[in-house]
Interface confidence: medium
């Protein structure tokens, strides 16, 4: 028998520095977690103790903090090289700055293979990107070889900016021939490493003949065997065992997100490359693990530029940006409109001639808007200003919901109106009218939404049975502020870009902004 140790991360999302337990900015260092310096300590400890170790990343290193905003992927290549990752799969967010923003800082600089079998380049891009990412890679590990085959969410064109010269194929269809090729090369230990979410990971384990282990990402799935060490609630045991269609037991793993855990999976193979046993657990990277001093000092060196960036002007406002709780928790506020407009703008993807865009709607809890911005400071808007407005380090995600769920959400928005509570929704691409004289749960008297399948966008009444795409904060997608109906009833959820980054990019693009209060939210019966 031959033992392999798989160390894995996924959805790190720019958390190069240690973070608080909820993966936001580290405040009390003695209770902080993760970060590449701490990760390196643990990885080195395992490499020294065990003979056959692979360090893998399942995608979405890009996007999530000011590190990515400033360094645009150079920081990913640098620190992944420093940690000596063995392979990485492309995630959807790796395309956030277009194909060029992937090629130059990451693909050309990584000292490890970057993989995806279901992304095919065409046209002029085919020769430019040739060899910079691969469908699979055979890695020597000790006296054996291990094949790693990559995959990426086929929804990437709707979630990011891969352009028109990359085709995202069905994962299972694309993986099978590559695995077959590995088999003909006499590679009998094969890991599928990819970024399509836990449901697809399980399908790959079930359907793709010859895959021995699946290491996934995208859905931020936390798996654990035994008592979990932090706040995350396991979605199943680690590893999650799938019985394949040809009768094999295939371990599937994922390691939550944000570099909080290091996935640790031990696999035992027989001489024919069959998995005899698999066991492990994610390792919580808490403060009991010291940060490596060399990597930490390197982080501090790279940090300096971030502090300078946060005070530079992104753009100007010529109006007061009203982000006060007195406004945003009670009525339409222009800060809410600005943020929602930025959220929609960030999701412009012309992937189908029938649609002007794939999504037109935005909802945003008023309680998530934490500060106004005064225009009397020469109109200047900085990253620092935006960090005061959106201090929680969240993301603006894409969900699919039925109209009936949206209606419930808007009823929840005003079910206890007047108490300055955070659930009051700010909107984009939506016209809502409330009648507060009616009883809670029956206060939405009009709900019109902007069409997407139209050449001239206009507002039509919400249809209860229709499925709509909506951009909203991850906080709401996870049921925050009491929006349990969103969490329970959403049909699809894809995590998006860092909230501040979305707004800062929009302001930089617009240069001068002047958002108005324009009647997106109205109150009837003269009560407001």
């Amino acid at each position: 028998a031959w033992e392999l140790t798989i160390l894995h991360t996924n959805d790190v999302h720019s958390r190069l520095e240690q973070t608080s337990e909820d993966s936001s900015k580290c405040v009390n260092a003695s209770r902080c977690m993760g970060g590449v310096a701490r990760l390196f300590t643990k990885v080195q400890q395992i490499r020294r103790a065990e003979p056959n170790v692979l360090l893998l990343d399942a995608g979405d290193q890009y996007q999530g903090t000011i590190w990515f905003t400033v360094y645009k992927g150079a920081e990913v290549a640098h620190f992944m090289n420093a940690l000596r990752y063995d392979a990485m799969a492309l995630g959807n967010h790796e395309f956030d700055n277009g194909v060029e923003g992937l090629i130059e800082p990451l693909l050309k600089e990584a000292k490890f293979p970057i993989l995806s079998a279901n992304i095919k380049a065409k046209g002029p891009l085919a020769s430019q990107i040739s060899g910079l990412y691969l469908p699979y890679k055979v890695l020597p590990v000790g006296d054996e070889v291990v094949g790693i085959v990559g995959y990426t969410s086929k929804e990437t064109p709707f979630l990011s900016n891969p352009g028109t010269n990359l085709v995202f194929e069905d994962e299972i269809t694309a993986l099978q021939p590559e695995v077959d090729k590995l088999k003909t090369l006499n590679v009998n230990k094969i890991i599928a490493l990819g970024h399509s979410g836990f449901e697809m990971d399980k399908l790959i384990a079930q359907k793709v003949r010859g895959v021995d282990v699946v290491v996934g990402g995208h859905s931020n799935t936390f798996l654990y065997t035994g008592n979990p060490p932090s706040k995350e609630v396991p979605a199943g045991k680690y590893p999650f065992i799938v019985t394949s269609d040809d009768g094999r037991k295939v371990p599937v793993v994922q390691a939550y997100a944000f570099g909080k855990y290091l996935g640790y999976l031990k696999i035992e193979f027989d001489e024919r490359g069959n998995v005899i046993s698999s066991h492990g657990n994610p390792i919580l990277l808490n403060s009991s693990i010291p940060e490596d001093p060399s990597i930490k000092a390197d982080i501090n060196k790279w940090r300096i530029k971030l502090d300078n960036y946060s005070t530079q002007e992104l753009g100007k406002t010529i109006v007061y940006l009203d982000g006060s709780s007195q406004s945003c928790r009670f009525r339409e506020c222009n800060m809410g409109n600005l943020i929602c407009d930025a959220m929609i703008n960030n999701n412009l993807r012309h992937t189908d001639e029938m649609f002007w865009n794939h999504v037109s709607m935005c909802i945003l809890n008023g309680g998530g808007i934490r500060s106004p911005i005064d225009e009397r400071n020469n109109g200047t808007i900085t990253w620092e200003n935006l960090a005061a407005v959106l201090p929680f380090g969240g993301t603006f995600d894409l969900v699919q919901l039925k109209g009936s769920t949206l209606k419930k959400a808007f009823e929840h928005s005003v079910h206890r109106y007047g108490q300055s509570t955070g659930e009051f929704l700010q909107v984009g691409g939506i016209h809502v009218v409330y009648d507060l004289s009616r009883k809670p749960g029956d206060r939405v008297v009009k709900l019109d939404v902007l069409c997407t399948k139209c050449r001239v966008p206009s507002y039509d009444p919400l249809k209860m049975d229709e499925v709509y795409k909506v951009i909203l904060p991850n906080f709401l997608a996870n049921g925050g502020d009491g929006f349990q109906m969103i969490k329970d009833e959403l049909l699809r959820h894809d995590s998006g870009d860092q909230d501040i980054n979305v707004v800062s990019t929009y302001i930089s693009k617009m240069k001068v902004i002047y958002p108005a209060v324009e009647g997106r939210i109205k109150f009837s019966t003269g009560s407001h």
Epitope: R48, Y71, A74, A77, H78, N81, A82, R84, E104, P105, K108, E109, K111, P293, S294, I295, K296, A297, D298, K301, W302, I304, K305
Partner: antibody, heavy 119, light 108 residues
Framework: QVQLVQSGAEVKRPGSSVKVSCKAS????????ISWVRQAPGQGLEWMGG????????NYAQKFQGRVTITADESTSTAYMELSSLRSEDTAVYYC????????????WGQGTTVTVSS | SYVLTQPPSVSVTPGKTARIACGGN??????VSWYQQKPGQAPVLVIF???DRPSGISERFSGSNSGNTATLTISRVEAGDEADYYC???????????FGGGTKLTVL
């Protein structure tokens, strides 16, 4: 394949300055650590200082502080090392070397530039 | 400032194993690189990250680092291995790169 090509040999008078260049080709320049290392005849390797161009600021070994200036021009992927107030003990081969970071090891070295200080 | 100490010379017969030590206070907390330098040539990295070999370096070269000592081990020594060997660390406290004094390996 990354290469570092250094400028040619120099003969200098005591008290003068010398500026050695190191041009990188075949890879990204800005986020890598460029170190300058010298070796006097029959002696060991001595680190003078280094720069990571993306940050702009260099750091110097205490021994050379105030006498050495290390700069980088990102547009031409070239690093420079200038040593002033030369004395005969500065006669040495001067190397530039590149690594992911200072702790990562210097994976690529220039061919070396001989600087002779003589009156 | 931080100091790395190496023996000035080590001798070994062909086919045998050479071990070159590098000493420093709590050296295991730092990351050690090793360089080989032949007369008239630029140094060549043979070990980085304590134990890793760059591509193109023979597997006869290996490294270890624990306590106050790092060791470069060259197994089945060949005449072509005769060279000066330098250990190197980065001292994160001073932000300085430190080289050991070098060890001359003689193949008898």
């Amino acid at each position: 394949q990354v290469q570092l090509v250094q400028s040619g040999a120099e003969v200098k008078r005591p008290g003068s300055s010398v500026k050695v260049s190191c041009k990188a080709s075949g890879g990204t320049f800005s986020s890598y650590a460029i170190s300058w290392v010298r070796q006097a005849p029959g002696q060991g390797l001595e680190w003078m200082g280094g720069i990571i161009p993306i940050f702009g600021t260099a750091n110097y070994a205490q021994k050379f502080q105030g006498r050495v200036t290390i700069t980088a021009d990102e547009s031409t992927s070239t690093a420079y090392m200038e040593l002033s107030s030369l004395r005969s003990e500065d006669t040495a081969v001067y190397y530039c070397a590149r690594g992911v970071s200072y702790y990562y090891g210097m994976h690529v070295w220039g061919q070396g530039t001989t600087v002779t200080v003589s009156s | 400032s931080y100091v790395l100490t190496q023996p000035p010379s080590v001798s070994v017969t062909p086919g045998k194993t050479a071990r070159i030590a590098c000493g420093g206070n709590n050296l295991e907390s730092k990351i050690v690189s090793w360089y080989q330098q032949k007369p008239g040539q630029a140094p060549v990295l043979v070990i980085f990250y304590d134990t890793d070999r760059p591509s193109g370096i023979s597997e006869r070269f290996s490294g270890s680092n624990s306590g106050n000592t790092a060791t470069l081990t060259i197994s089945r020594v060949e005449a072509g291995d005769e060279a000066d060997y330098y250990c190197q660390v980065w001292d994160s406290n001073s932000d300085h790169v430190i080289f050991g004094g070098g060890t001359k390996l003689t193949v008898l």
